[in-house]
């Protein structure tokens, strides 16, 4: 008799197989919080960039990638205090003289209003009400994202 | 009548409220190789170490984390040409001079024999029969993972 | 109880050195930037530098660069002001503060030790 | 540098009097001020950040407002505790973090 986690196991199997989905998030995990199609987690130490960035990736998710000017809002109504400073998966990349998301796409100028440098070694953070460009040497906090809802297609076969 | 995708979820969440897990894969997404408890990506592009470790972020994973000299040789097996080499998620601190892993702990020596230097900006990769420091700016492949089975207790509260 | 102590004040010669030593308590000291602040005899305040929470950065103005040391020990909940080629005017209290958390660089002082005085006379 | 110039120099008040201090960067500074108070032989105490955001446990009487180059502490009923020298400082993330020259609040 197999448990109904087991049971899953072989239901979502057959569900990949048929539709190539990555086995998602159905629930956000404890700690973190529901935005939309998205778990995201606020953390409470600070770090450079870098250190938050590998922070996220061993927590088996991603610095926070912002999709448009309306989800920076949502997400910027979750923090609480008007100075504190998260950083997010975008950095400023010194070859492409752009700001670039850590998925390799590139900021639409239009989605975030920068306040600060684009610069070498610059990265971004927001606030409650503002983008910055801060140093990635910076020590503050940070947002991990993980996707909610399976992603039909999401095969990842290679960047 | 809900689909069994649909009753999977009710009863993973069962699960995950009864024991604090977090909602862990139940099987490896298309492309990802099974070792064990995890699921690997082996990258057939090149990257520096910093991208390396920003791509297996936004694909929510960690670049590879090695537990011991066991683990190791069974990555290695893996790896079909003798040449080549990945990066993992091990690199050099220097306010710490010591190797640390992306998740903050250190290396305990005895675990992997490193070729090369413990030096500012080196980071550390595999080939089939070795494993080596390298210049973090080197483009080479790299090893993302993920976690196969759900971890107990395993909760994120914060880093 | 949260606070600051700072100690290691006293009169010194011009040419001379000091190290002004700042114990915190009642938080997370690893978490903070943290900062040295003085303030001459009936003047106002002046920033001389300050150590990012894991001691990797740090900052110093232009008026003390080069004679003056910030360092911290998280294990002992302590931060620390080297000073050498004291100067007469380097006569001030000096306090330690610490910034608001996450705020990064930018450093707001929410809260200071009571000061301590360095007199640079001959 | 930023300069940063507080103005008046000193003000006599009255209890229940509205004080207002401005405080003058050189160059732009988005939102980035801090109000402090400082009693005789006392550390300063953050009253304001962010420009506007009241520091926990200072009492509402006291407010911050201003963006950009031109800011300003309003204390809307002196109290007879308030009496001190009020000093702004620049945040921007970029040492110096320099203070302005302060502004004495007295007694009338």
């Known amino acids: 008799q197999k448990s109904s986690i087991e049971k899953c196991s072989v239901d979502i199997q057959q569900s990949r197989n048929k539709t190539t989905e990555r086995p998602g998030l159905l629930n956000c995990p404890i700690y973190w919080q529901q935005l939309r199609e998205k778990c995201l987690l606020f953390s409470h130490t600070v770090n450079p960039w870098n250190n938050s960035l590998a922070d996220c990736s061993t927590k088996e998710s991603s610095l926070l990638l912002i999709r448009d000017k309306d989800e920076l809002i949502h997400t910027q109504n979750l923090i609480r205090d008007k100075a504190i400073l998260f950083w997010i998966g975008l950095n400023f990349s010194l070859s492409e003289k752009n700001w670039k998301w850590i998925n390799g796409s590139f900021l639409n100028s239009n989605d975030l209003e920068i306040r600060g440098d684009a610069k070498e070694n610059s990265c971004i953070s927001i606030s409650q009400t503002s983008v910055y460009s801060e140093y990635c040497s910076t020590e503050i906090r940070w947002i991990c994202q993980k996707e909610l809802t399976p992603v039909r297609n999401k095969v990842y076969p290679d960047s | 009548q809900k689909s069994s995708i649909e009753k999977c979820s009710v009863d993973i969440q069962q699960s995950r409220n009864k024991t604090t897990e977090r909602p862990g894969l139940l099987n490896c997404p298309i492309y990802w190789q099974q070792l064990r408890e995890k699921c690997l990506l082996f990258s057939h592009t090149v990257n520096p170490w910093n991208n390396s470790l920003a791509d297996c972020s936004t694909k929510e994973s960690s670049l590879l984390l090695i537990r011991d000299k066991d683990e190791l040789i069974h990555t290695q097996n893996l790896i079909r040409d003798k040449a080549i080499l990945f990066w993992i998620g091990l690199n050099f601190s220097l306010s710490e001079k010591n190797w640390k892993w992306i998740n903050g702990s250190f290396l305990n020596s005895n675990d992997l024999e490193i070729r090369g230097d413990a030096k500012e900006n080196s980071c550390i990769s595999i080939s089939q029969t070795s494993v080596y420091s390298e210049y973090c700016s080197t483009e080479i492949r790299w090893i993302c993972q993920k976690e196969l089975t759900p971890v107990r207790n395993k909760v994120y509260p914060d880093s | 109880q949260v606070q600051l102590v700072e100690s290691g004040g006293g009169l010194v010669k011009p040419g001379g050195s000091l190290r002004l030593s700042c114990a915190a308590s009642g938080f997370t000291f690893g978490q903070y930037y943290m900062s040295w602040i003085r303030q001459a005899p009936g003047k106002g305040l002046e920033w001389v530098s300050y150590?990012?929470?894991?001691?990797?950065?740090?900052a110093y103005a232009d008026s003390v660069k080069g004679r003056f040391t910030i360092s911290r020990d998280n294990a002992k909940n302590s931060l620390y002001l080297q000073m050498n080629s004291l100067r007469a005017e380097d006569t001030a209290v000096y306090y330690c503060?610490?910034?608001?958390?996450?705020?990064?660089?930018?450093?707001?002082?929410?809260?200071w030790g009571r000061g301590t005085l360095v007199t640079v006379s001959s | 540098d930023i300069q940063l110039t507080q103005s008046p120099s000193s003000v006599s008040a009255s209890v229940g009097d509205r004080v207002t201090i401005t405080c003058r960067a050189s160059?732009?500074?988005?939102?980035?001020l801090a109000w402090y108070q400082q009693k005789p032989g006392k550390a300063p105490k953050l009253l304001i950040y962010?420009?506007?955001s009241l520091q926990s446990g200072v009492p509402s009487r006291f407010s911050g407002s201003g963006s950009g180059t031109d800011f300003t502490l309003t204390i809307s009923s002196l109290q007879p505790e308030d009496f001190a020298t009020y000093y702004c400082?620049?945040?921007?993330?970029?040492?110096?973090?320099?203070f302005g020259g302060g502004t004495k609040v007295e007694i009338k």
């Open positions: 150590i990012s929470p894991s001691g990797a950065t740090i």
């Open positions: 503060a610490r910034s608001l958390m996450s705020t990064g660089t930018h450093l707001y002082f929410d809260l």
């Open positions: 400082q620049q945040v921007t993330s970029f040492p110096p973090y320099t």
């Open positions: 160059q732009g500074i988005s939102d980035w």
């Open positions: 962010a420009a506007s």
